[in-house]
Interface confidence: low
């Protein structure tokens, strides 16, 4: 299967019911502290506001946040760690009425309440220490 380049940036239009699907694998073993970062941006620029920031510190924790006017807001942290060292995973981010719900390998693990309207999301960027095999947005 061919790999997508990382950082992977894609123009999107999201609404309630949309799903962002990502299939990837950590590039290095957890001992070397790889990260995964997914950012839902409000413009096609990497320094724009972020409606949903999802960062995995593999083997450690997950952090979710938003960034408005270049200011990071209150962080939401989870110690849930369903990701396996060296294993491919499927990440699905569901856009619900009131929140983003993040599923890993078919199970719901994380929730993040909307702070910025979903309709303002223009771009999704997937990056950091992963090999990316799939990125898909379905509405």
């Amino acid at each position: 299967m061919s790999l997508l380049s990382v950082p992977h940036t894609e123009s999107v239009s999201l609404s309630t019911g949309s799903t962002v699907t990502i299939e990837a694998r950590p590039l290095v073993c957890f001992f070397n502290e790889p990260h995964l970062q997914v950012d839902f941006h409000t413009e096609m620029k990497e320094d724009s506001d972020i409606a949903f920031h999802f960062q995995v510190y593999f083997g450690n924790r997950v952090v979710m946040n938003s960034r408005e006017y270049r200011t990071w807001k209150e962080e939401v942290e989870s110690k849930n760690m369903p990701f396996q060292d060296g294993q491919e995973f499927e990440l699905r981010i569901l856009v619900l009425e009131d929140k983003y719900q993040v599923m890993v390998n078919g199970q719901a693990y994380y929730n993040f309440n909307h702070r910025i309207p979903v309709s303002s999301v223009k771009m999704v960027q997937v990056w950091r220490d992963i090999s990316l095999t799939k990125f898909n947005v379905s509405n």
Epitope: K45, D47, Y69, R70, T71, W72, K73
Partner: antibody, heavy 116, light 112 residues
Framework: QVQLVESGGGLVQPGGSLRLSCAAS????????MSWVRQAPGKGPEWVSD????????YYADSVKGRFTISRDNAKNSLLLQMNSLKPEDTAVYYC?????????WGQGTQVTVSS | QTVVTQEPSLSVSPGGTVTLTCGLS?????????PAWYQQTPGQAPRALIY???SRHSGVPDRFSGSISGNKAALTITGAQAEDEADYYC????????????FGGGTHLTVL
């Protein structure tokens, strides 16, 4: 713990140049936007320049635009400020600072004096 | 040129309450300015107290609180202590680009 250590300050004549460095440790440097903030003697702090986490976007105060250049090396956990065409009014303590919610972490500062 | 205004000096008695304000030379401070507050003692770098109007940084005593009151941001110290004597600076976010974060001139607080 988080440490920001500035260096490179000193005495320079008007029109001269200096290159300030900030060595970062104790946090994931590549995740953070970084800033330079200066404070002239007896005055309040003044924002000088910002660079985003990836280094692709930079911002400058009007007072230094075209003379100062901010850059970073995420592999070396290093923030730089190249200062050219220095003026007496650039005399200040220069701090590097960062944080997801404003300037939470500060260095101890490095003194820059522009005088003939 | 945007000017952020603060009272040059204020005083408070130990145990008393004092409010420092942060305004704009033209216009009102709003939530979109994300007011923040910093404390500085002589010879030290500033210390972050409050961000995004009223969020306290970790380790900051709850006697420090932030708000927007009228057309200004405000920092209130309730039950002032001797160690609160310092210079206090506010910052306002003014939009991406030049001078996107502007510091106020500072308020020197004396605890008498």
């Amino acid at each position: 713990q988080v440490q920001l250590v500035e260096s490179g300050g000193g005495l320079v004549q008007p029109g001269g140049s200096l290159r300030l460095s900030c060595a970062a440790s104790g946090f994931t440097f590549g995740n953070y936007d970084m800033s330079w903030v200066r404070q002239a003697p007896g005055k309040g702090p003044e924002w000088v320049s910002d660079i985003n986490s990836g280094g692709g976007s930079t911002y400058y105060a009007d007072s230094v635009k075209g003379r100062f250049t901010i850059s970073r090396d995420n592999a070396k956990n290093s923030l730089l400020l190249q200062m050219n065409s220095l003026k007496p009014e650039d005399t200040a303590v220069y701090y590097c600072a960062t944080g997801y919610t404003g300037y939470y972490y500060w260095g101890q500062g490095t003194q820059v004096t522009v005088s003939s | 040129q945007t000017v952020v205004t603060q009272e040059p000096s204020l005083s408070v008695s130990p145990g008393g309450t004092v409010t420092l304000t942060c305004g704009l030379s033209s216009g009102s401070v709003t939530s979109s300015n994300y007011p923040a507050w910093y404390q500085q003692t002589p010879g030290q770098a500033p210390r972050a107290l409050i961000y995004s109007i009223n969020s306290r940084h970790s380790g900051v005593p709850d006697r420090f609180s932030g708000s927007i009151s009228g057309n200004k941001a405000a920092l209130t110290i309730t039950g002032a202590q001797a160690e609160d004597e310092a210079d206090y600076y506010c910052t306002l976010y003014m939009g991406t680009g030049s001078n996107n974060v502007v510091f106020g001139g500072g308020t020197h607080l004396t605890v008498l």
